[in-house]
């Protein structure tokens, strides 16, 4: 059974990843829009299901392009390094997820774009967060 | 209402320059890509390139990179498409259109160009 | 450069089903969108996002996608959608865009 220290832990990573991803969905809509539509072209996949930590495969699955997709973003206007934030999410998606289990991710039919891809996960944080509290 | 016109169709010689032009209304022209399609006689749409006209960042293709240049004059919501010296090969509609979002949503009822000696 | 590929012709009779592929290495990671244009016209956005239709644009025109490939489904097939069905999409860059060769659908 979860200690209340794990769980603390657990929620600290939550929170962590959670302040990352909206960060980079706020530095996506101050990037001068639309010139966003250009990252919009991209299409991400989204899970079937999402309510457990373990269903963070299918968010670790998606950093690679979403690194990709960001550092079509590097200008004045948007400060992010991504292969530093993608790397700090990586850090955190393993330690939540675990790695002693394996996981196949099942992705949903319809893909997504960054803006909604970014959101789904954002809301996947905030109720699992919700639930440690 | 949104809407793209553009200048009417030119007839001209090989060797001459031209400037055609798309006229944005309706809506913020600043803040929305326009790109410019080429379709020959008979033929499918080819993609030139893409201006964003708040501050003229531009994308070509390769196929017409230093061929054509596009332009815009932000001011008065126009997009510009001009060659230096025109060949009978440039023969072509040329459509401009809005890229938003959800793709090329609005277009220009297209400008013929005939070049001929 | 990059492309797309499209069949060059479908033929297909009044109330039946057309399907238009479209094929290009970079669609798994690129949203497609689809084309129809009539003789004489500019052509007009039919669906966006691979799957989505814009408002105005009949309930029969549907759009798929299953990793390098695109489909414009049209359903109960009408002597009016007798035009020429083009995909674009972009690049794995995001860089360029490109349409695909073009599809003339046919009505018997």
């Known amino acids: 059974a979860p200690t209340s220290s794990s769980t603390k832990k657990t929620q600290l990573q939550l929170e962590h990843l959670l302040l990352d991803l909206q960060m980079i969905l706020n530095g996506i809509n101050n990037y001068k829009n639309p010139k966003l539509t250009r990252m919009l072209t991209f299409k991400f996949y989204m899970p079937k299901k999402a309510t457990e930590l373990k269903h963070l495969q299918c968010l670790e699955e998606e950093l690679k392009p979403l690194e990709e997709v960001l550092n079509l973003a590097q200008s004045k206007n948007f400060h992010l390094r991504p292969r530093d934030l993608i790397s700090n999410i990586n850090v955190i998606v393993l330690e939540l997820k675990g790695s002693e289990t394996t996981f196949m991710c099942e992705y949903a039919d319809e893909t997504a774009t960054i803006v909604e891809f970014l959101n789904r996960w954002i809301t996947f944080c905030q109720s699992i967060i919700s639930t440690l509290t | 209402e949104v809407q793209l016109v553009q200048s009417g169709a030119e007839v001209k010689k090989p060797g001459e320059s031209l400037k055609i032009s798309c006229k944005g209304s309706?809506?913020?022209?600043?803040?929305?890509?326009i790109g410019w399609v080429r379709q020959m006689p008979g033929r499918g749409l080819e993609w030139m390139g893409t201006?964003?006209?708040?501050?003229?960042?531009?994308r070509y293709s390769p196929s017409f990179q230093g061929q054509v240049t596009t332009s815009a004059d932000k001011s008065i919501s126009t997009a510009y498409l001009q060659w230096g010296s025109l060949r009978a090969s440039d023969t072509a509609m040329y459509y401009c259109?809005?890229?938003?979002?959800?793709?090329?949503?609005?277009w220009g009822q297209g400008t013929m160009v005939t070049v001929s000696s | 450069s990059y492309e797309l590929t499209q069949p060059p012709s479908v033929s297909v009779s009044p109330g039946q089903t057309a399907r238009i592929t479209c094929s290009g290495d970079?669609?798994?990671?690129?949203?497609a969108y689809w084309y129809q244009q009539k003789p004489g016209q500019a052509p007009v956005l039919v669906i966006y996002?691979?799957?989505e239709r814009p408002s105005g644009i009949p309930e029969r025109f549907s759009g798929s996608s299953s990793g390098t490939t695109v489909t414009l489904t049209i359903s109960g097939v009408q002597a009016e959608d007798e035009a020429d069905y083009y995909c674009?999409?972009?690049?794995?860059?995001?860089?360029?865009?490109?349409f695909g060769g073009g599809t003339q659908l046919t009505v018997l």
């Open positions: 259109a809005r890229f938003s979002s959800s793709a090329y949503d609005i």
């Open positions: 309706g809506y913020n022209f600043d803040t929305y890509w």
């Open positions: 201006i964003y006209p708040a501050d003229s960042d531009t």
């Open positions: 970079a669609l798994p990671r690129q949203f």
């Open positions: 996002k691979d799957t």
């Open positions: 674009q999409s972009a690049d794995s860059s995001g860089t360029y865009h490109v």
